[in-house]
Interface confidence: low
């Protein structure tokens, strides 16, 4: 039975050219996290594997930085980065948990950053 819940930074906005931290946190379960995937729509951005560590997709390696924690830092934002991002937690024995974050990249210099938290 899957008892866990995913907390995320929710809907966030950031300025074009800036950076933002995407964060998810899995709570209310004792399941072991074996891997976390970060995806943007259907594109894989990064993987953090319990045995192999971080892997950043080659097409994003110049603009995506790992961490902090299981989070992901997006840099040099463009308006094309606007959209849905998913953190996919692979766990044992529970299975897969998915969290959703919507990022809006604004041209304006008055972009309001959503609440951000760090793990642990």
């Amino acid at each position: 039975m899957m008892t866990g819940t995913i907390e995320t930074t929710g809907n966030i906005s950031a300025e074009k050219g800036g950076s933002i931290i995407l964060q998810c946190h899995l709570s209310s379960t004792t399941a072991q996290v074996t891997q976390v995937n970060w995806e943007q729509q259907d594109q894989l951005l990064a993987i953090c594997n319990a045995d192999l560590g971080w892997h950043i997709s080659p097409s994003f390696k110049d603009r995506v930085a790992p961490g902090p924690g299981l989070g992901l830092t997006l840099q040099s934002l463009t308006v094309n980065d606007t959209g849905e991002y998913f953190c996919i937690y692979h766990t044992y024995p529970d299975g897969t948990y998915t969290g959703r974050i919507f990022l809006e990249v604004l041209e304006s210099s008055v972009a309001e950053h959503g609440a951000r938290f760090q793990i642990p």
């Epitope: 971080w54 790992p66 961490g67 924690g69």
Partner: nanobody, 116 residues
């Protein structure tokens, strides 16, 4: 069995420096990140800094520009160089693999006291 041993703590005056070390045995951190964490009296443990294979580093805002994290994978050791120390840096400092969600092994910690 995984063992982490932190060392290098002590009493230092405000503005002073310390270098902490974390030696790991029974595992290797070369394929993951190493993190330093701290726990002040009466507070929850908080993340301080992390270093990824290849040297990428990131820091908590409270220590940015003052602390430097590094790792020597050949020695399986992580370091935390702490400069311009403040009384609020007083805490027990721990190292662990980061993200800790992927297997949280903790050592006994090393106490850093910043006081005049």
């Amino acid at each position: 069995e995984v063992q982490l041993v932190e060392s290098g703590g002590g009493l230092v005056q405000p503005g002073g420096s310390l270098r902490l070390s974390c030696a790991a045995s029974g595992t290797t951190f070369s394929s993951a990140a190493m993190g330093w964490f701290r726990q002040a009296p009466g507070k929850e443990r908080e993340w301080v800094a992390s270093v990824l294979r290849g040297g990428y580093t990131w820091y908590a805002d409270s220590v940015k520009g003052r602390f430097t994290i590094s790792a020597d994978n050949s020695k399986n050791t992580a370091y935390l160089q702490m400069n311009s120390l403040k009384p609020e840096d007083t805490a027990v400092y721990y190292c662990a693999r980061d993200p800790v969600e992927l297997g949280d092994y903790w050592g006994q910690g090393t106490l850093v006291t910043v006081s005049s």
